[in-house]
């Protein structure tokens, strides 16, 4: 329908109706991650896969160099999870130092991109301190949330460190999004 | 509406239209859960509360048997908290020994099954090591996130062990989806 | 649309149609909290920023008072994340004595409140056990699931400890509505 | 057990059409996506189009993009390849393949259950 | 499109032998290749995936590696069974595409 009203003579219609299979919808899944270059105080993002197994795009919502293009305005629900895991080192020598081989902490942020502007737009932050004490931890940070999104808007999902990201399985870190 | 379109013979729709408060929904609270059997292989799977408080079922989505029943194609947001909690024993002894009474990990799956494959396929799964040092230790998992199913699709929420859930109130523990 | 039906003469309508844009939504976003009095069974609620940077309210869904006023009945998708952080004594002192400056555990519950009854409804609760052992730590706790409200329902979320939520910033802490 | 049987294959003159059909049974349908990989008389094998079962997005070789067209019927478990213009150099066998997924940011998988086959020969 | 190239076109080798083919990708497919043997008749078998994993009930004698553009199957003792024609295929980006083939033939 994208859009188009209905409005048979006898009757004024003020909004437009649209198909809910009709909108923008995307839920992407984790892939094995490529070391890239990143600037200096900006977590990298993460690359996707968009297509195979749980990931689809659809209604003109695409993904593509890490982002999803948002294809019209609207409200969209957004969402990701991504699953940190790594090694603790357990030895006495580097407990005693104070530095396990562990992150202080873990943190993934969902970023708007709006080309007419420069700096992109931290919608959505999940923190973590870290202070498992086992040889191997691993953990979730789960986020969600609706947003106001323009036409050519751009989404991505940044990290604080992607040699932390579980990249084993589609059901563990993702990213989704769709219009309301 | 049901997907019934409205064409008024001037104008030409293209997809259906349906009432939004049409479309299948639940919403399931968690139950104190009966000790079953399951396969060495595999999770068990809640079982929930349908009808009473705030949990409730509408407009052709069933629950029945730890399953949510699909009953029409399209894509559905799903999600689920589990709220586990624990005791650590304290003892020296058992300190000593480096077994506290806790497990390594906890872990929440949601599941798809489909009636034509006797395969599961996992949609999600939120899995986290525990590290608690104190008596009592408790914690959620949450997850949510959107998925293509079937007409027929059955959906079930598998845990590391059931014995670890918290039953006690309706809104630490939860599982819900609803047709976008 | 408002729930107006489209009925040309040849057909029957058997639901409303509506516009998904004129659906009551909102997506609040953190402020500092000013200390309130509170009951003392009852955690304190936040107050919220409703207009400012990545918050909005639409469509008759107001803020007023840290309630949101729902404007019409059916079913809601409803969410929040709260990030804690506080800092943790690391003095041999208070470590032996086995009470570092902490809390035992964090909770999050949003909560309904229905006029014609006296008891607020606890939709949905988000609560763990802290054990951390860093100087500093954060993490958040985050929320959501569908509800069928009826039309001036007042919904609110409530922590365990003001102090310890983090109102640095609207990507941390939040707390959102919509209808379906 | 996992199977796929193609079916609709046969002698068509140029410039005509086809419909190849592929049942699928055994596994769940919907996860994983399925392609149409052709081999020519004597030739190597050639792929001709993918479609994701679970949303219906397709890809297709750019040679055959705009004559062939991949759709799938869930509720049937089935897929199809309509072709339409065929031409002489389009005789070959056609094979419907699974393309397995192993459901990890890991690995891409393969085409591991293959059809036996039907036959499309295109001559006047 | 990326191209794939697999040399030898054709090898002779006798039972026991070890056998050694290459596949050569026109640009990075990082890890997505699979390889895949086909007799005279019948459909393909996929043999390894991701360039180095073997697929459910394939022999431990079939071997894969690589990455990048540079891709090698390997069998360590020739079977009987062995002699068909293997085809490389990179799944990195669409379109795939299968490398022209070798053929193994008995010595």
């Known amino acids: 329908l994208k859009g188009q009203e209905f409005a048979p003579s006898h009757q004024q219609v003020y909004a437009p109706l649209r198909a809910d299979g009709d909108k923008p919808r995307a839920h992407l899944t984790v892939v094995r991650q490529t070391p890239t270059q990143h600037f200096k105080n900006q977590f990298p993002a993460l690359h996707w896969e968009h297509e195979l197994g749980l990931a689809f795009t659809k209604n003109r919502m695409n993904y593509t160099n890490k982002f999803l293009l948002i294809p019209e305005s609207g409200d969209y629900f957004i969402y990701s999870q991504v699953t940190f895991r790594g090694m603790t080192s357990e030895s006495s020598e580097i407990r005693q130092a104070g530095r396990p081989n562990k992150p202080d902490s873990i943190t993934v942020v969902i970023t708007k991109v709006t080309d007419s502007y420069p700096e992109p737009t931290q919608l959505l932050m999940g923190t973590k301190s870290v202070s498992e004490v086992g040889s191997n931890w691993f953990q979730p940070i789960y986020l969600g949330a609706m947003f106001s999104l323009q036409e050519g808007d751009k989404l991505m999902v940044n990290v604080s460190d992607i040699s932390l990201v579980d990249y084993t399985k589609e059901d563990k870190t993702f990213f989704g999004a769709f219009l309301l | 509406l049901k997907g019934q379109e409205f064409a008024p013979s001037h104008q030409q729709v293209y997809a259906p239209l349906r009432a939004d408060g049409d479309k299948p929904r639940a919403h399931l609270t968690v139950v104190r859960q009966t000790p079953t059997q399951h396969f060495k292989n595999q999770f068990p799977a809640l079982h929930w509360e349908h009808e009473l408080g705030l949990a409730f079922t509408k407009n052709r989505m069933n629950y029945t048997n730890k399953f949510l029943l699909i009953p029409e194609s399209g894509d559905y947001f799903i999600y689920s908290q589990v709220t586990f909690r624990g005791m650590t024993s304290e003892s020296s002894e058992i300190r000593q020994a480096g077994r506290p009474n806790k497990p390594d990990s906890i872990t929440v799956v949601i599941t798809k099954v489909t009636d034509s494959y006797p395969e599961p396929t996992q949609l999600l799964m939120g899995t986290k090591s525990v590290s608690e040092v104190g008596s009592n230790w408790f914690q959620p998992i949450y997850l949510g996130a959107m998925f293509s199913l079937q007409e027929g699709d059955k959906l079930m929420v598998n845990v590391s062990d059931i014995s670890l859930v918290d039953y006690t109130k309706e809104d630490k523990t939860f599982f819900g989806a609803f047709l976008l | 649309l408002k729930g107006q039906e489209f009925a040309p003469s040849h057909q029957q309508v058997y639901a409303p149609l509506r516009a998904d844009g004129d659906k009551p939504r909102a997506h609040l976003t953190v402020v500092r909290q000013t200390p309130t009095q509170h009951f003392k069974n009852q955690f304190p609620a936040l107050h919220w920023e409703h207009e400012l940077g990545l918050a909005f309210t639409k469509n008759r869904m107001n803020y007023t008072n840290k309630f949101l006023l729902i404007p019409e009945s059916g079913d809601y998708f409803i969410y929040s994340q709260v990030t804690f952080r506080g800092m943790t004594s690391e003095s041999s002192e208070i470590r032996q004595a086995g009470r570092p400056n902490k809390p035992d555990s964090i909770t999050v519950v949003i909560t309904k409140v229905t006029d014609s009854y006296p008891e607020p409804t606890q939709l949905l609760m988000g609560t763990k056990s802290v054990s951390e052992v860093g100087s500093n730590w954060f993490q958040p706790i985050y929320l959501g699931a569908m509800f069928s409200l009826q039309e001036g329902d007042k919904l609110m979320v409530n922590v365990s400890d003001i102090s310890l939520v983090d109102y640095t910033k609207e990507d941390k802490t939040f707390f959102g509505a919509f209808l379906l | 057990e996992v199977q796929l049987v193609e079916s609709g294959g046969g002698l068509v003159q140029p410039g005509g059409s086809l419909r190849l059909s592929c049942a699928a049974s055994g596994y769940d349908f919907t996860y994983y996506g399925i392609s149409w990989v052709r081999q020519a008389p004597g030739k190597g094998l050639e792929w001709v189009a993918w479609i994701s079962t679970y949303n219906g997005n397709t890809h297709y070789a750019r040679m055959l993009q705009g004559r062939f067209t991949i759709s799938r019927d869930n509720a049937k478990n089935s897929l199809y390849l309509q072709m339409n213009s065929l031409r002489a150099e389009d005789t070959a066998v056609y094979y419907c393949?699974?393309?397995?997924?192993?459901?990890?940011?890991?690995?891409?998988?393969?085409?591991?259950?293959w059809g036996q086959g039907t036959t499309v020969t295109v001559s006047s | 499109d990326i191209q794939m190239t697999q040399s030898p076109s054709s090898l002779s080798a006798s039972v026991g032998d070890r056998v050694t083919i290459t596949c050569r990708a026109s640009q990075s497919v990082s890890s997505y290749l699979a390889w895949y043997q086909q007799k005279p008749g019948k459909a393909p078998k996929l043999l390894i995936y991701?360039?180095?994993n073997r697929a459910t009930g394939v022999p431990s004698r079939f071997s894969g590696s690589g990455s990048g553009t540079d891709f090698t199957l390997t069998i360590s003792s020739l079977q009987p069974e062995d002699f068909a024609t293997y085809y490389c295929?990179?799944?990195?980006?669409?379109?795939?595409?299968f490398g022209q083939g070798t053929k193994v033939e008995i010595k």
């Open positions: 991701d360039a180095s």
């Open positions: 393949a699974r393309e397995n997924y192993y459901g990890s940011g890991a690995y891409r998988g393969g085409m591991d259950v």
């Open positions: 295929q990179q799944r990195s980006n669409w379109p795939w595409t």
